[in-house]
Amino acid sequence: FERTRSLQDPCSNCPAGTFCDNNRNQICSPCPPNSFSSAGGQRTCDICRQCKGVFRTRKECSSTSNAECDCTPGFHCLGAGCSMCEQDCKQGQELTKKGCKDCCFGTFNDQKRGICRPWTNCSLDGKSVLVNGTKERDVVCGPSPADLSPGASSVTPPAPAREPGHSPQ
């Protein structure tokens, strides 16, 4: 089959890094400077991606593979193949149209990217808050109040956790 195909289509023999040159009676020609073909049988070479501005070069272009970009410090990649760079924010913030804004009370963001997410509601799982949440960190849920009642376990229970706004009984 391969032999039949190559007899029918001489371009199928052109390896990566070359293109099938119609101007030269369909012989394989190496890709011109700053272009590439990553697969065989190509009729053109693709122009290399240039990592400019907020993009920086992670991998140089070659005749057989495109350049790869990432983002300069203070920015992070978005999209397939790092098609966009988005500004970083601090932990405890999210990026809005007006720039980086602190997370609202009851929400947190532990990364330099993404949006602020609500704290975990411990009570939905019948648990209590062991460590309060902050703008940068989610709450830490502890054992349920029932687990902490005397006689619930033969193991000595830990001291009850204080929930925010509660004074010790």
């Epitope: 890094g17 190496p30 890709c31 011109p32 400077p33 070659s62 005749s63």
Partner: nanobody, 111 residues
Framework: AVQLVESGGGLVQPGGSLRLSCAAS????????MSWYRQAPGKQRELVAW???????HYADSAKGRFTISRDNTKKTLYLQMNSLKLEDTAVYYC?????WGPGTQVTVSS
Amino acid sequence: AVQLVESGGGLVQPGGSLRLSCAASGNIFSIRVMSWYRQAPGKQRELVAWFAWDNIAHYADSAKGRFTISRDNTKKTLYLQMNSLKLEDTAVYYCNSGDSWGPGTQVTVSS
């Protein structure tokens, strides 16, 4: 324009070796891609070995492991070292850069 002239062809037995040379003159500073092609009687010209614009050597499947492309920029010369030659390597070998072609040098492998 760039002028190219090949040399080093000849008659050799199967399993033998030859070293082809391609001397370049003219505006060689614009050269980034240089290639060796060959054309056997009644067949289409085929790419054998080349230096890509990123300065990496590449080879057609038929040349891998047997042929080596190299160059000496001080002498403005491209080379093709051909080892373990086979009957099917018989062809006229051409040096190429862009639109410039040498006149070719005949390589005949025969017992």
